[in-house]
Interface confidence: low
Amino acid sequence: SSSPTSSASSFSSSAPFLASAVSAQPPLPDQCPALCECSEAARTVKCVNRNLTEVPTDLPAYVRNLFLTGNQLAVLPAGAFARRPPLAELAALNLSGSRLDEVRAGAFEHLPSLRQLDLSHNPLADLSPFAFSGSNASVSAPSPLVELILNHIVPPEDERQNRSFEGMVVAALLAGRALQGLRRLELASNHFLYLPRDVLAQLPSLRHLDLSNNSLVSLTYVSFRNLTHLESLHLEDNALKVLHNGTLAELQGLPHIRVFLDNNPWVCDCHMADMVTWLKETEVVQGKDRLTCAYPEKMRNRVLLELNSADLDCDPILPPSLQTS
């Protein structure tokens, strides 16, 4: 393991277009980029908390696990990891907490073995639709990614460029149908208000989906029907009020599913009857005995499993004295 102390020797930040150029000089077998730590035995390179502004050009060809966390990368250009020879063994890439606000089309091209990518804790104001697919073709070459970690990538409100953040992320997930092999997708803590209806149908290999700590109010237009391999669905800490019949039936039909629904503000009125009936019968909801009502006030903290149809009424829109037949 080597840990050079010399200053980073990277190209000028005034010429960012150079970042997409393929490095022409193959690194020496034992070379380790400045400000990084390398272990050939572990096939690991760590450039952690070094305030790097660019991806090092001289990454060793043996790298299988690359950590670039805690830096100041800002922009990930096309071909940011393209090298000659290519980084053919790079399987796991962690870029979390590196102040990335833009990931451009083709940023992860020429990484044929990349199975896990973590972009968490970066304020991604501009995520290209072709960040993961690398091409704007209607059907791209399949991505090797099986695990995509995108927790807390929502930028501050004033940096969201007047467009749907949900839409931007989903466009990148669906472009070119490149992520058909994705098995784990984590999207926790992104202030999602909704889930675009197409997204899950086009990710048929998903085993684990984490949408916890968002602001999802409803799943009415979301279909889980095609996710026959789904094992865990995390919906904790959202703003869900009720799950309707269609959603309940789809979840019940998934053979391996475990659903997590803790800490949602369930509304216990007449619309909750189907969900309560389902909860009493299903085995798919983990910790279902801990789910409690948040509204209306008279039902607050009541356990959903302990409710019966008489508890679940809907107040008339008008007081009875003002209603006409």
């Epitope: 696990n65 796991a92 896990q116 973590d118 927790n151 926790a188 916890s212 904790e236 803790d262």
Partner: antibody
Framework: EVQLLESGGGLVQPGGSLRLSCAAS????????MSWVRQAPGKCLEWVSA????????YYADSVKGRFTISRDNSKNTLYLQMNSLRAEDTAVYYC??????????????WGQGTLVTVSS | DIQMTQSPSSLSASVGDRVTITCRAS??????LNWYQQKPGKAPKLLIY???SLQSGVPSRFSGSGSGTDFTLTISSLQPEDFATYYC?????????FGCGTKLEIK
Amino acid sequence: EVQLLESGGGLVQPGGSLRLSCAASGFDFESYAMSWVRQAPGKCLEWVSAISGSGGSTYYADSVKGRFTISRDNSKNTLYLQMNSLRAEDTAVYYCARYYGGYYSAWMDYWGQGTLVTVSS
Amino acid sequence: DIQMTQSPSSLSASVGDRVTITCRASQSIRSALNWYQQKPGKAPKLLIYAASSLQSGVPSRFSGSGSGTDFTLTISSLQPEDFATYYCQQTYGYLHTFGCGTKLEIK
């Protein structure tokens, strides 16, 4: 049935090295993060290290950072802990455990039986 | 790092008693808290995850509550097999620290 079986523990001198292994079976190994937790004799549990399903993300307690390396071989369904520069205070039973859950809420739902590491001259 | 403080460190109680163990985090961890039971010479066993969800197969006399910084494990009616050491663990930060345990002994 999920099973985790640790091995590789033993007596080692201060400054020495040891590699622990944890053989996993009964589940889709590469889909789960894994962890090492230790317990010194008569002491509390101490979280040591964790690794994501593909091995791309690793985390360490401050007490072992720079000395221990967690890794996994998904083709062999095996988790490893390489321990270098061992100290007397590293003496403990080391458990491997499977993580379940998401980023903000994860828990260790299966544990191995533990392997004892003794660092003494 | 997030520190976890458990209290009391030890507790004597009788079969049938209602017992409460508390765990406090040094900062908010939302509901990312788990409770484990450990008996001498054995590996820990998961009881409660995500602050209040009962792990499959765990008796319903165990319950968890709390969010933010203050959490509670309650055993509604102690059984002989419940005498053990109980640990809380947070998984909100990158480093998933444990509390130092509460040893529950027979009075």
